[in-house]
């Protein structure tokens, strides 16, 4: 009667421990589906912000920082006020960002289109020789393919021209202690899906 | 997918205004400048001037100043070219390009005025 | 104002043929050039900045080198679409201004 009783025993313990490795199955499925769900829900909080940012230049879904551009995957802020360049990489970091790293061909455009004054101010990027006469890197230490923009010497500037500033959509080397205005730039964060709630009263207004 | 769509065609007499409008979409107005350029029937390609999308500052080469008005809508995405007492060598297409004045990577589809008493 | 003088004019080839446009600036323009072609009744297309290079999704059968005042655009082995008018414009400050243009015609 007791081995019976064990041996029924043996059956519900195996059972249960069935059950629990099902169960265990249908959770691990559950958190899979849930990721991948999230990821979906990211990437279209993530569109439709784009779409609310590019109508209006501004959005709260935005995930920049208040007064910061949101560019491609980056937000950006164009300062007036003129710094030496490496007071400017002193200010990004102040701010929990660096200078202006140009990548690729629409982040000139933009820099350009933003940077661009009837009244000749340049601002500095994160490019620097920090060997007099050698390569050109960014800040990150990433080098400069000259593909993407031609640096002219600017041969007035009485020092060393290691420091590269952008002047209306042309790209000068200049004495890093001139004065040009800053350029900061920080990765764009995750743009919440909860900022997106729109009151059911907006609906189909402006469209 | 960004698109720069302008308006259709317009037939003016001489002294008449025309307002052209140039709607982009597929990124933020507001990140690059808009630059006009005209082109002349058979003829090349000239640069007007561009407004700031960001201050709404217009700037106009030396031959479009006077009779000629950048604005925006920038809630519509929208730039707006003017051309106010039309004269006959205003018969042309007019472009909208994208970007600060450098290249232009996307153009408008151009709207022809023609002027014609 | 900077000048841009494009030759020739006018130009015939065949398809499969490789044809070279110049253009030349009045002053330097550093490698500030870019070109575009149009065809007609079209808007013009963007081919090529910094004066060597090539727009995203252009065919690398177009090619630009030069510097200074000195630029041309090379066309390898041409295909039936490339056909039209090419315009090089510098982008050195303002005002920008374009070549009269040079238009590629099928022999």
């Known amino acids: 009667q007791y081995y019976q009783l064990s041996n029924t025993g043996q059956d519900t313990i195996s059972q249960m421990e069935e059950r629990l490795g099902n169960t265990s199955q249908e959770l691990q499925s559950l958190q899979v589906q849930n990721i991948k769900l999230a990821g979906s829900l990211q990437h279209v909080a993530e569109k439709l912000c784009r779409e609310l940012y590019n109508k209006a230049g501004a959005h709260r879904c935005s995930p920049c920082t208040e007064q910061w551009k949101w560019h491609g995957d980056n937000c950006y802020q164009f300062y007036k006020d003129s710094k030496s360049w490496e007071d400017c990489k002193y200010f990004c970091l102040s701010e929990n960002s660096t200078m202006l790293k140009i990548n690729k061909q629409e982040d000139l455009e933009f820099a350009a289109s933003q940077s661009y004054s009837e009244f000749f101010y340049s601002y500095w990027t994160g490019l620097l020789r920090p060997d007099s006469g050698k390569a050109w890197l960014w800040m990150d230490g990433t080098p400069f393919t000259s593909e993407l923009f031609h640096i002219i010497i600017d041969v007035t500037s009485p020092r060393s021209r290691d420091c590269v500033a952008i002047l209306n959509g042309m790209i000068f080397s200049k004495d890093c202690k001139e004065l040009k205005r800053c350029v900061c730039e920080r990765r764009a964060g995750m743009v919440k899906p909860e900022s997106l709630h729109v009151p059911p009263e907006t609906l189909g207004e402006g469209d | 997918q960004i698109h720069l769509v302008q308006s259709g065609p317009e037939l003016k007499k001489p002294g008449e205004t025309v307002k052209i409008s140039c709607k982009a979409s597929g990124y933020t107005f507001t990140n690059f400048g808009m630059n006009w350029v005209k082109q002349a029937p058979g003829k090349g390609l000239k640069w007007m001037g561009w407004?700031?999308?960001?201050?709404?500052?217009?700037t106009y080469a030396d031959d479009f100043k006077g009779r000629f008005a950048f604005s925006l809508e920038t809630s519509a995405s929208t730039a707006y070219l003017q051309i106010n007492n039309l004269k006959n060598e205003d018969t042309a297409t007019y472009f909208c390009?994208?970007?600060?004045?450098?290249?232009?990577?996307?153009w408008g589809q151009g709207t022809l005025v023609t002027v014609s008493a | 104002d900077i000048q841009m003088t494009q030759s020739p004019a006018s130009l015939s080839a065949s398809v499969g043929e490789t044809v070279t446009i110049t253009c030349r600036a009045t002053?330097?323009?550093?490698?500030?050039l870019a070109w575009y072609q149009q065809k007609q009744g079209k808007s013009p297309q963007f081919l090529v900045y910094?004066?060597?290079t090539l727009a995203e999704g252009m065919p690398s059968r177009f090619s630009g080198s030069g510097s200074g005042t000195q630029f041309s655009l090379k066309i390898n082995i041409l295909q039936p679409e490339d056909f039209g008018t090419y315009y090089c414009?510098?982008?050195?400050?303002?005002?920008?201004?374009f070549g009269a243009g040079t238009k590629l015609e099928l022999k």
């Open positions: 390009a994208r970007g600060a004045p450098a290249w232009f990577t996307y």
């Open positions: 407004i700031n999308t960001n201050t709404g500052e217009p």
């Open positions: 002053e330097n323009i550093y490698s500030y």
């Open positions: 910094n004066a060597k």
């Open positions: 414009q510098h982008h050195f400050g303002t005002p920008l201004t």
